[in-house]
C-alpha cells in the first residue's frame, strides 16, 4: 500500500464515484476525492511486476493450493480416524489456506487488468482480509504444529481426548484472535480511484486520511506479536528436537523419523524465509517510510513480498506429508490416479501372499494408514 | 519547446460564464494534466480544478457546481469554463501543466487571461 | 484543507543581501512543497519542487531547505532581477498556496 495525496471536495472517501450533480468530461468522470501517487509507485502499478508476474504467481498458488488443501482438509476430516492435536492444527492450516486461495481468481483478475477493482469495496475488505489473516493463522497454526511436534518427541504418551480438545480450544481461540486483529482491515476503506492511472486500486494505494502512522503502528503490532513471537517459539522447538533426535538411539524407525523431522525443519525454514519474514519485514518498513518521508523506496519489494507470502498456501501441503501418513497415503494415490481403497486391496493380497510364503521382504510401511503424531 | 498559450482578455456580466481556452505545443495533453489557477487582483494565487490526460476531471470544494474543465486532445487544447460569474470572480485565470503525480509540480504556465466581470 | 504560512509577507534588502523566506504549513507535508517566483505582470514560474530540488534552469543561489511543517527558501546573494513575489504551494493533501513574501529593494 502506498500514501495516496487525498483532495477531498466534500470530507468524504468516497471515490470514483460519478455524482449526480458532477460534470462528466469527454471520456473521464468529475471524482469527488482524488488521490494522487508520485510517479514510481505509478509505474509498478501499471509495470508488468503487477500485471504480469503477479497473476503468474497467484495462478500457480491458486492451481497448486486449492486442490491440495482441499484434499487435505478432506483427509484430515474424513479420512483420519485419529483426531491427534497435529491433525487438528493441519486442518486448521488447510482451512486458512482455502479460505485465502478461494478469493484468487478475483486477486489474477484485478492485477491482470492493470490493477483496477471492479468488484466492489465489500469483496475488495474480505479479500484483504482473508488475505492477511491467512497469512498470521499459518504462522500461529505453524507454531503450534511445531511445538506439537517437540512435546511428542519429549512425552510419547499415547493419544488422549483431553490433548484433542486442548487442540481444538487453542484453535478456536487462533481464529478468534486472527478475527480481532483483522477488524481494521475489515473497516478502513480499501478501494481507492486513482484519477491519473484511471484505475479503482483494492489496498495497493491508502488514502492519507487513514492515519499512515497508525498503519505503522498496526503492522508493527502484528510483527512482533504474531509473527516474530511465534517465529522464536517456533524456532526453539525445532532446535530442541534436532537436539533430542541426535540423542536418541539409532534404529531404521528412529532414522526415517529423524530424516522426516529434518525435512519438516527444512520446509518450515524455507516457508519463514520465502514467504512470512520478507513480508512482514517490509511491511514494517514500508510504512515507516510512508511515515517518516511521505513515500516509500522499497513499494516494489513490497509488493514481492506480500505476493511471496501466498507461496505459504503451497509449501503448507509438504508440511501435511512429512507429518501426516494419512495425507502422506492420499497424496501419493492421488498423484498416481489410484484410490486408496485400491491400494489397501493390493496391501491384503500382498499381506495373504507374504503369510503363504512367510516371507517378509514385501514389507511396505508407506501404504499404511497411520497417523504419526 | 513546452509553450501554454491561453486566449485573450474578456469582459463579462455578472450571471453569465466565460470559457478560456489553453492551447498546449511541445508535449501531449494526453501524457499530462492540466491545471487551473487564478489570481485576483493584488492577490494571492488560487487552485481551482485539474483535468487529467484520460479526461478525469477534479474541482476545488469551492468551485464544484460551477467550474467545468474540459479538453480537446484534437486540437491539444485544455478549456476553464466558469459559469454564475460574480464580481469576485475578476482575476488573471493561468493554466499550468502538472505531470499528473504527486512529486511533480506545475513545471509551466501560461501567459494567463484576464477575465472582468463588470455589470 | 492546509493552510500555508508565509513570512514575512514584504522583505526590504539590498542586492548581494542573502534572503530567507519561511513557508509554515498546518499539518506535515511531507517533502510535497515547491517554490514560485511571480514578478507583476507574469505568470509564475517554478524555482524549487518538492522542498530542495531545483527547476531546470534556475541559478544555483536558489536554494531549499525543510521538511514536514517548515520551509525555506534561501537566495544566497540577490540579484537585481530576484525581487519578485515568492509563493509556496504544498501538494501533499490538495493544492495551496501560501499568501506569498514580497522581496523589495532596500
Known amino acids: 500500500t502506498i500514501q495516496g495525496t487525498n483532495r477531498s471536495s466534500k470530507g468524504r472517501s468516497l471515490i470514483g464515484k460519478v455524482d449526480g450533480t458532477s460534470h462528466v468530461t469527454g471520456k473521464g468522470v468529475t471524482v469527488e476525492t482524488v488521490f494522487s501517487v508520485d510517479e514510481f509507485s505509478a509505474s509498478v502499478l501499471t509495470g508488468k511486476l503487477t500485471t504480469v508476474f503477479l497473476p503468474i504467481v497467484y495462478t500457480i498458488v491458486f492451481v497448486v493450493g486449492l486442490p491440495s488443501n482441499g484434499m487435505a482438509l478432506w483427509v484430515f476430516l474424513f479420512r483420519t480416524k485419529k483426531k491427534h492435536p497435529a491433525v487438528i492444527y493441519m486442518a486448521n492450516l488447510a482451512l486458512a489456506d482455502l479460505l485465502s486461495v478461494i478469493w484468487f481468481p478475483l486477486k489474477i483478475a484485478y492485477h491482470i487488468h492493470g490493477n483496477n477493482w471492479i468488484y466492489g469495496e465489500a469483496l475488495c475488505n474480505v479479500l484483504i482480509g482473508f488475505f492477511y489473516g491467512n497469512m498470521y493463522c499459518s504462522i500461529l497454526f505453524m507454531t503450534c504444529l511445531s511445538v506439537q511436534r517437540y512435546w511428542v518427541i519429549v512425552n510419547p504418551m499415547g493419544h488422549s481426548r483431553k490433548k484433542a480438545n486442548i487442540a481444538i480450544g487453542i484453535s478456536l481461540a487462533i481464529w478468534l484472535l486472527i478475527l480481532l486483529v483483522t477488524i481494521p482491515l475489515y473497516v478502513v476503506k480499501q478501494t481507492i480511484f486513482i484519477p491519473a492511472l484511471n484505475i479503482t486500486t483494492c489496498h495497493d494505494v491508502l488514502p492519507e486520511q487513514l492515519l499512515v502512522g497508525d498503519m505503522f503502528n498496526y503492522f508493527l503490532s502484528l510483527a512482533i506479536g504474531v509473527f516474530l513471537f511465534p517465529a522464536f517459539l517456533t524456532a526453539s522447538a525445532y532446535v530442541l528436537m534436532i537436539r533430542m533426535l541426535r540423542s536418541s538411539a539409532m534404529d531404521e524407525n528412529s532414522e526415517k523419523k529423524r530424516k522426516r523431522a529434518i525435512k519438516l525443519i527444512v520446509t518450515v525454514l524455507a516457508m519463514y524465509l520465502i514467504c512470512f519474514t520478507p513480508s512482514n519485514l517490509l511491511l514494517v518498513v514500508h510504512y515507516f517510510l510512508i511515515k517518516s518521508q511521505g513515500q516509500s523506496h522499497v513499494y516494489a519489494l513490497y509488493i514481492v513480498a506480500l505476493c511471496l507470502s501466498t507461496l505459504n498456501s503451497c509449501i503448507d501441503p509438504f508440511v501435511y506429508y512429512f507429518v501426516s501418513h494419512d495425507f502422506r497415503d492420499h497424496a501419493k494415490n492421488a498423484l498416481l490416479c489410484r484410490s486408496v481403497r485400491t491400494v489397501k486391496q493390493m496391501q491384503v493380497s500382498l499381506t495373504s501372499k507374504k503369510h503363504s510364503r512367510k516371507s517378509s521382504s514385501y514389507s511396505s510401511s508407506s501404504t499404511t494408514v497411520k497417523t504419526s503424531y | 519547446q513546452v509553450q501554454l498559450v491561453q486566449s485573450g482578455a474578456e469582459v463579462k456580466k455578472p450571471g453569465s460564464s466565460v470559457k478560456v481556452s489553453c492551447k498546449a505545443s511541445g508535449f501531449s495533453l494526453s501524457s499530462y494534466a492540466i491545471s487551473w489557477v487564478r489570481q485576483a487582483p493584488g492577490q494571492g494565487l488560487e487552485w481551482m480544478g485539474v483535468i487529467w490526460g484520460n479526461g478525469n476531471t477534479y474541482y476545488a470544494q469551492k468551485f464544484q457546481g460551477r467550474v467545468t474543465i474540459t479538453a480537446d486532445e484534437s486540437t491539444s487544447t485544455a478549456y476553464m469554463e466558469l459559469s454564475s460569474l460574480r464580481s469576485e470572480d475578476t482575476a488573471v485565470y493561468y493554466c499550468?501543466?502538472?505531470?499528473?503525480?504527486?512529486?511533480?509540480?506545475?513545471?509551466?504556465w501560461g501567459q494567463g487571461t484576464l477575465v472582468t466581470v463588470s455589470s | 484543507e492546509i493552510v500555508l504560512t508565509q513570512s514575512p509577507a514584504t522583505l526590504s534588502l539590498s542586492p548581494g543581501e542573502r534572503a530567507t523566506l519561511s513557508c509554515r504549513a498546518s499539518?506535515?507535508?511531507?517533502?510535497?512543497l515547491d517554490w514560485y517566483q511571480q514578478k507583476p505582470g507574469q505568470a509564475p514560474r517554478l524555482l524549487i519542487y518538492n522542498a530542495y530540488s531545483r527547476a531546470t534552469g534556475i541559478p544555483a543561489r536558489f536554494s531549499g531547505s525543510g521538511s514536514g511543517r517548515d520551509f525555506t527558501l534561501t537566495i544566497s546573494s540577490l540579484e537585481p532581477e530576484d525581487f519578485a513575489v515568492y509563493y509556496c504551494?504544498?501538494?501533499?493533501?490538495?493544492?495551496?498556496f501560501g499568501g506569498g513574501t514580497k522581496v523589495e529593494i532596500k
Open positions: 499539518q506535515n507535508v511531507y517533502k510535497w
Open positions: 504551494q504544498q501538494h501533499n493533501s490538495g493544492w495551496t
Open positions: 499550468a501543466r502538472w505531470r499528473g503525480y504527486k512529486d511533480y509540480p506545475f513545471d509551466y
